[in-house]
Amino acid sequence: IPVIEPSVPELVVKPGATVTLRCVGNGSVEWDGPPSPHWTLYSDGSSSILSTNNATFQNTGTYRCTEPGDPLGGSAAIHLYVKDPARPWNVLAQEVVVFEDQDALLPCLLTDPVLEAGVSLVRVRGRPLMRHTNYSFSPWHGFTIHRAKFIQSQDYQCSALMGGRKVMSISIRLKVQKVIPGPPALTLVPAELVRIRGEAAQIVCSASSVDVNFDVFLQHNNTKLAIPQQSDFHNNRYQKVLTLNLDQVDFQHAGNYSCVASNVQGKHSTSMFFRVVESAYLNLSSEQNLIQEVTVGEGLNLKVMVEAYPGLQGFNWTYLGPFSDHQPEPKLANATTKDTYRHTFTLSLPRLKPSEAGRYSFLARNPGGWRALTFELTLRYPPEVSVIWTFINGSGTLLCAASGYPQPNVTWLQCSGHTDRCDEAQVLQVWDDPYPEVLSQEPFHKVTVQSLLTVETLEHNQTYECRAHNSVGSGSWAFIPISAGAHTHPPDEFLFTP
């Protein structure tokens, strides 16, 4: 950002004074200020000097310094007051043009900030402002009439109190122009259309404007259609309507239809697409994978997108098993219409229970027939573990059964002392069983695996622990040999599976 010297945001000087404003930047800098006489400009690389040897009230204004090469577009400003006892106002423009509801700035700049307390805005010849004129004053910029109305198109003067008397500026003419309406407003109904060959169809193009002078037409694939026009006037607007009625559609009627309206302000157009099909259609699809895996206790939303014409005559979600004959609750099924021919159907399955794994099918029907889309839902479970001591072929063996989904991995640990769970400090040996025997592996069920650890002699002051883990969690079981026989410990946090 450039820097201005002197280092003040505003300066007050007397008429006839010498004023030198210096702007320094990293690159070249430029001055911008009100058009006024007597300024000279001297540039020297990264600095620029604006100076006058004879300041007048007309030099009152804001001088801005910019650095054109600065990508951030930074600027610095200083406001100069040249306080002339005879000239309290410097008027920068004598005509101001705005549209209705815009703010109108009347640029009469105060030449002495001390006078601010006694300023007012009046109409010429001392007439008061019109009622409801909302305005504000800035000594740097002038008076602003907020949200100007057409009726406020008047000649104004800025007034300042000097030594007990009001001193007026030259007049400023304000022209408030009515907002010229843009191109006509349009509607084209329907936004999309599908018909089977031989059916009837209707397309309606309508345009409205505050002014009667506008044209509207309907075109099919860039060909203007000759359609009788209906005209109306209501809600202070002129309306023109074109209705295309087709008794028996054929493939040549398909394509793009555009509704176009124009006036002196310009042109508006809106389009729709008309599809003609040979027969009814019904398409089901999903953005989701049809094979879903979810952890038990979590929720899942199954979503199906339906594209159909004619509309659906029936639809429902069905549970196909294998666990129970329960059916999805209707209140958990939700349907939303994206547009006339596309719908989304959602089945919410909150807090999934083991008996809710299996196949879910969405069925829909229209004159084109039945369609179905089936999801397969498998539940994930953390492993459950149990250990028993047995003899196999005469050898003492620890047998660990672990069930869960996905298939659990098994690790054996031997550690010193009697404990519910081996910690690192106690571990004497670790065995990973890379290929536990799969005892059961049915669709939608847990996978049960078995791992054997042959132990020649059970050490009585030691613990044998079987640990199983999968992507959901882990489980373990500690086996503690006791002289009176083997003793097993499930972990304290033994998992309860509903």
Epitope: E5, V8, P9, E10, L11, T18, R22
Partner: antibody, heavy 112, light 106 residues
Framework: QVQLQESGPGLVKPSETLSLTCTVS????????WSWIRQPPGKVLEWIGY???????NYNPSLKSRVTISVDTSKNQFSLKLSSVTAADTAVYYC??????WGQGTTVTVSS | DIQMTQSPSTLSASVGDRVTITCRAS??????LAWYLQKPGKAPKLLIY???SLESGVPSRFSGSGSGTAFTLTISSLQPDDFATYYC????????FGQGTKVEIK
């Protein structure tokens, strides 16, 4: 006749933030520019910074990292915040309108 | 930073004397210089701005001159109310003050 009045705690602990308020009466804070200046005991005047009604602010480079000057136009007040103070910040603090109207000053001592 | 050096630091004078205080800037400040008067326990009061412009309400016995780096404050005829400390201040680049000149009764 515009008058300025400084207010705030007379004692601030080291490392804390000094907060002062200047109340403007007899005129609007929505024009001119307003500054803070301080004078340590028996020492030279030191400019802290100013802000202008159009949103322009400028701070003494040696204090910039610790200073914030803000304005509340609804209360016709502006304030100074100086963070991480030390004994060297002990001074009489003045608020001013431009260079011509000054408050009478308020003494701030930094001590534990 | 621009340094401002005032001289003398102390000046003894009598009522009616013509008094001159000088202020020197470490680099050119054009004529962006102000002079203040300060009495013990009081806020400074603006006397001169833009090196030579007299602030409204200030007696005409005070005048300022100079540009660039050398500036002078002159009191044409010292009055009892003028015994105080005087400060110069540059506002060309940020603001800095001189160290002050104390005018005391001789």
């Amino acid at each position: 006749q515009v008058q300025l009045q400084e207010s705030g705690p007379g004692l601030v602990k080291p490392s804390e933030t000094l907060s002062l308020t200047c109340t403007v009466s007899g005129g609007s804070i929505s024009s001119y520019y307003w500054s803070w200046i301080r004078q340590p005991p028996g020492k030279v005047l030191e400019w802290i910074g100013y802000f202008s009604y159009n949103g322009n602010t400028n701070y003494n480079p040696s204090l910039k990292s610790r200073v914030t000057i803000s304005v509340d136009t609804s209360k016709n007040q502006f304030s100074l915040k100086l963070s991480s103070v030390t004994a060297a910040d002990t001074a009489v603090y003045y608020c001013t309108r431009g260079m011509d109207v000054w408050g009478q000053g308020t003494t701030v001592t930094v001590s534990s | 930073d621009i340094q401002m050096t005032q001289s003398p630091s102390t000046l003894s004078a009598s009522v009616g004397d013509r008094v001159t205080i000088t202020c020197r800037a470490s680099q050119s400040i054009s004529d962006w210089l102000a002079w203040y008067l300060q009495k013990p326990g009081k806020a400074p009061k603006l006397l001169i701005y833009k090196a030579s412009s007299l602030e409204s309400g200030v007696p005409s016995r005070f005048s300022g001159s100079g540009s660039g780096t050398a500036f002078t404050l002159t009191i044409s005829s010292l009055q009892p109310d003028d015994f105080a400390t005087y400060y110069c201040q540059q506002y060309n680049s940020h603001w800095t003050f001189g160290q002050g000149t104390k005018v005391e009764i001789k």
